[in-house]
C-alpha cells in the first residue's frame, strides 16, 4: 500500500520560516503534488504550491521555494509574516496524484516540545484519504 | 489560431483607476491560466500576476498584489485587470499573455499590449 | 525571489555573423524530477510585443528558424544566433519558468552594423 510522509520544520534563524518535506513510497507514477496548510485540500484546507512532474511550480504566498527533491520527494519553505505567517501548530498536508495509485494524503506539523532547528524523523504520517 | 485583443492605449489621471482588457480568441478560454505583465518604456518585463479562468483563482507577484486586481467573464472570454491608485510609475505597456499546456509559466501567445499613460 | 541577469546589455554584430549572449540564474532552474532547466528566451521586436523562441532550456517553439540555439543548464545559460540576420535587429530576454513568480532578465540589445 502507498505511504505519505510530512515531515514539518521550523528553521533556527528565523521563527516564522518553516521548511516542509513531503515523499511519496509507493511504485506508482506521480503527477502531481499539492501541498495546503489548514487542513487536507479541498477540505477547508488552503493551497501553497502545485506541482507538476512536467510543467513547473505554481506557489503563493507565503510559500517561498518548492522544488522537487527526487522524483518521489519534494520540499518547500515557507516564509510568512503577520497574517500570512504560520505558527507552530499549523496543519500541513501533501497530496500525491499518481498512476495508478490514485491519490493519497497525509498531514503533519511541528512536534509539540520540537526547538527551532530541530524537527522530527520523516516517518510516514496518517494517511487521510486516498481516492 | 490563438488571439490576445487589447486596446492599444489608455491615458488616466494620477489617484484614479484603469481596467485594462484582453479578449481571447481562438483556443478554449478556460484551458489555460492567463497572465500579465508589464513593460516599463527601454525597461525589462515584469509579471504582475496570473488568473485561471475556469475557476478565478488568482496568483500575483507580492509587488503588485495591491495595485491588480485581475478578473475574467467567460460571457465574452475576456480577462481584466484593474489597476488602482495611479502614479507615474504605473505607466507602462501592460500585456497579457496565456501559455500551451507545457508548462505553467511558459508566455506562448501574447496580446499587442496597452499603453498606459499617467498624467494629470 | 529568483533574479535573473542577462549580459552583455548590448551587441552589435554584422549580419552572418555568429552572436552569444548569456543568463544566469541565482538558483538553480533544473527540475529534480525530470533534470530539465525552466528557462526560456523571448525575442522583443522594436514596437512589438515579446515572441517566445526557446523553452526548456533548449526546445525551440515552433516555427522559430534552427539558426536559435538555446544551451545550458543549472544557473547559466546562453542563447547562440547561428548566423545572425537583419530581421534578428530585437531585444532578447530570458525568463525562468521554474516557479512562481517567473522573473525576466535585465534583456540584451542586439544591433546589426
Known amino acids: 500500500t502507498p505511504e505519505v510522509w510530512v515531515q514539518v520544520r521550523m528553521e533556527a534563524t528565523e521563527l516564522s520560516s518553516f521548511t516542509i518535506r513531503c515523499g511519496f513510497l509507493g511504485s506508482g507514477s506521480i503527477s502531481l503534488v499539492t501541498v495546503s496548510w489548514g487542513g487536507p485540500n479541498g477540505a477547508g484546507g488552503t493551497t501553497l504550491a502545485v506541482l507538476h512532474p512536467e510543467r513547473g511550480i505554481r506557489q503563493w504566498a507565503p510559500a517561498r521555494q518548492a522544488r522537487w527533491e527526487t522524483q518521489s520527494s519534494i520540499s518547500l519553505i515557507l516564509e510568512g509574516s503577520g497574517a500570512s505567517s504560520p505558527c507552530a501548530n499549523t496543519t500541513f498536508c501533501c497530496k500525491f496524484a499518481s498512476f495508478p495509485e490514485g491519490s493519497w494524503e497525509a498531514c503533519g506539523s511541528l512536534p509539540p516540545s520540537s526547538d527551532p532547528g530541530l524537527s522530527a524523523p520523516p516517518t510516514p504520517a496518517p494517511i487521510l484519504r486516498a481516492d | 489560431q490563438v488571439q490576445l485583443q487589447q486596446p492599444g492605449a489608455e491615458l488616466v489621471k494620477p489617484g484614479t483607476s484603469v481596467k485594462l482588457s484582453c479578449k481571447a480568441a481562438?483556443?478554449?478560454?478556460?484551458?489555460?491560466?492567463m497572465h500579465w505583465v508589464k513593460q516599463r518604456p527601454g525597461q525589462g518585463l515584469e509579471w504582475i500576476g496570473e488568473i485561471n479562468p475556469s475557476d478565478g483563482r488568482t496568483n500575483y507577484n507580492e509587488k503588485f498584489k495591491n495595485k491588480a486586481t485581475l478578473t475574467v467573464d467567460h460571457s465574452s472570454s475576456t480577462a481584466y485587470m484593474q489597476l488602482s491608485s495611479l502614479t507615474s510609475e504605473d505607466s507602462a505597456v501592460y500585456y497579457c499573455a496565456s501559455n500551451a499546456d507545457r508548462a505553467y509559466y511558459t508566455m506562448d501567445y501574447w496580446g499587442q499590449g496597452t499603453s498606459v499613460t499617467v498624467s494629470s | 525571489d529568483i533574479v535573473m541577469t542577462q549580459s552583455p546589455s548590448s551587441l552589435a554584430m554584422s549580419v552572418g555573423q555568429k552572436v552569444t549572449m548569456s543568463c544566469k540564474s541565482s538558483q538553480s532552474l533544473l527540475n529534480g524530477f525530470n533534470q530539465r532547466n525552466f528557462l526560456a528566451w523571448y525575442q522583443q521586436k522594436p514596437g512589438q510585443s515579446p515572441k517566445l523562441l526557446v523553452y526548456f532550456a533548449s526546445t525551440r517553439d515552433s516555427g522559430v528558424p534552427d539558426r536559435f540555439i538555446g544551451s545550458g543548464s543549472g544557473t547559466d545559460f546562453t542563447l547562440t544566433i547561428s548566423s545572425v540576420q537583419a530581421e534578428d535587429l530585437a531585444d532578447y530576454f530570458c525568463q525562468q519558468h521554474y516557479s512562481t513568480p517567473p522573473t525576466f532578465g535585465g534583456g540584451t540589445k542586439l544591433e546589426i552594423k
Open positions: 481562438g483556443y478554449i478560454f478556460t484551458s489555460s491560466w
